[in-house]
Interface confidence: low
């Protein structure tokens, strides 16, 4: 994740916003998109939470009326939202490297409200050129969002926007192996807004995940779990109303 990367850079980009032929819907990819090698803050940001607070989770006993960090999943049938556009990301027609995902997507949850936390099965794991798309709306007064790409009990990629960590908005990415979290990678560009709809796209590349929000490239995260085919579930949790979660090959 680039430590000096800004949304302005992402939006201005280069003359060729899609240097690798990604669908235009991916968003204004900056020049040399592959040139952000997951730089992080080694040793820095050792979890600077205010006393008694747990970054990304509601402080125990706080927020009366909201038991725990996630104040309840939406009931089925509420929070209607726009349907996902199944044709939004046309396939390139190229089969995936493993053949596990023919380029005919998307697959995943139907459009409409989904119960959060939500698990999206990824039956063959993830493969390069796989595009995962999540549509939803951030709840008012949101505290956190989390995407967890899971390999068994491990979390290969934890993408965690935090709306109020030490009075700052920050996105934290990490990996959890054998129940131990590794080095955090932090991104201060924060494209989410309480009460507003969002689109998160995660593109799997051979050596990293690439994340775009609302059609603008946000960050990339180098693979720490190398067995991509074993990353078989995406957990979606936090303070959101979830409209759809799907994947396709591009």
């Amino acid at each position: 994740m680039a430590d000096n990367f800004s949304l302005h850079d992402a939006l201005s980009g280069s003359g060729n916003p899609n240097p690798q032929g990604w669908p235009g819907a991916w968003g204004n990819q900056p020049a040399g998109a592959g040139g952000y090698p997951g730089a992080s803050y080694p040793g820095a940001y050792p979890g600077q939470a205010p006393p008694g607070a747990y970054p990304g989770q509601a402080p125990p006993g706080a927020y009366p009326g909201a038991p725990g960090a996630y104040p309840g999943a939406p009931a089925p049938g509420v929070y209607p939202g726009p349907p996902s556009g199944p044709g939004a990301y046309p396939s390139s027609g190229q089969p995936s490297a493993t053949g596990a995902y023919p380029a005919t997507g998307p697959y995943g949850a139907p459009a409409g409200p989904l119960i959060v936390p939500y698990n999206l099965p990824l039956p063959g794991g993830v493969v390069p050129r796989m595009l995962i798309t999540i549509l939803g709306t951030v709840k008012p007064n949101a505290n956190r969002i989390a995407l967890d790409f899971q390999r068994g009990n491990d979390v290969a990629f934890h993408f965690n926007p935090r709306f109020n960590e030490n009075n700052r908005r920050v996105i934290v990415c990490n990996t959890k192996l054998d129940n131990n979290w590794g080095r955090e990678e932090r991104q201060s560009v924060f494209p989410f807004e309480s009460g507003k709809p969002f689109k998160i796209q995660v593109l799997v590349e051979p050596d990293h995940f690439k994340v775009a929000v609302n059609d603008a490239h946000l960050l990339q995260y180098n693979h720490r779990v190398k067995k991509l085919n074993e990353i078989s579930k995406l957990g979606i949790s936090g303070d959101i109303d979830l409209t759809s979660a799907s994947y396709t090959m591009i």
């Epitope: 747990y54 989770q57 125990p60 949790s237």
Partner: antibody, heavy 121, light 107 residues
Framework: EVQLQQSGPELVKPGSSVKISCKAS????????MDWVKQSHGKRLEWIGY????????GYNQKFKGKATLTVDKSSSTAYMELRSLTSEDSAVYYC??????????????WGQGTSVTVSS | DIQMTQTTSSLSASLGDRVTISCSAS??????LNWYQQKPDGTVKLLIY???SLHSGVPSRFSGSGSGTDYSLTISNLEPEDIATYYC?????????FGGGTKLEIN
């Protein structure tokens, strides 16, 4: 405030099994690991393992594999630990504890009151 | 497994004293250390997480410090309700392991 209410004391015979419960309230049960800890003779604490209620994923201390089995019932927000082939070594107080993790943090932030298990013929 | 050692198994102090309880790990644990308090009735509470972060609702007279293999819990102004046994716990590697406990008594 988060609450973890454990089942009452158990007096059981050697060789038998026992299943103790931990009912969680005032937080979203599926969002946090539930850990279990053993305390023998009022002294050292030993971590048994954890279960993630959302997907049933577990992790055990090798020492307790085959001895303890962790399960959950999401509908009642209750975690269970079954201990089998009991011997006098298993006589102890057993605690459930909610654990949170995030980045550098991993701690058991709320504990049940403990369940005493006595193995005696 | 990582061994956690609390060399002082019991400690006697007077009200108002500053008390320090120490804990050492058999290998470096990168500040991945928590402190718990167990009252005589068996009630267990988290006091400090990640070496020095105070858990919600814990009085500010409790503080934690340390690095590498050596860590400590300090109570700056001992109160009657602090009578308890204090345990350190590492989470650098599974299995999580606890120290043997330090029982704090009032003179």
């Amino acid at each position: 405030e988060v609450q973890l209410q454990q089942s009452g004391p158990e007096l059981v015979k050697p060789g038998s099994s026992v299943k103790i419960s931990c009912k969680a309230s005032r937080y979203t049960f599926t969002d946090y690991n539930m850990d279990w800890v053993k305390q023998s003779h009022g002294k050292r604490l030993e971590w048994i393992g954890y279960i993630y209620p959302n997907n049933g994923g577990t992790g055990y201390n090798q020492k307790f594999k085959g001895k303890a089995t962790l399960t959950v019932d999401k509908s009642s927000s209750t975690a269970y630990m079954e201990l089998r082939s009991l011997t006098s070594e298993d006589s102890a107080v057993y605690y459930c504890a909610r654990s949170y993790y995030d980045g550098s943090y991993d701690a058991m932030d709320y504990w049940g009151q403990g369940t005493s298990v006595t193995v005696s013929s | 497994d990582i061994q956690m050692t609390q060399t002082t198994s019991s400690l006697s102090a007077s009200l108002g004293d500053r008390v320090t309880i120490s804990c050492s790990a058999s290998q470096g644990i990168s500040n991945y250390l928590n402190w718990y308090q167990q009252k005589p009735d068996g009630t267990v509470k988290l006091l400090i997480y990640y070496t020095s972060s105070l858990h919600s609702g814990v009085p500010s007279r409790f503080s934690g410090s340390g690095s590498g293999t050596d860590y400590s819990l300090t109570i700056s102004n001992l109160e009657p309700e602090d009578i308890a046994t204090y345990y350190c716990q590492q989470y650098s590697k599974l299995p999580r392991t606890f120290g043997g406990g330090t029982k704090l008594e009032i003179n």
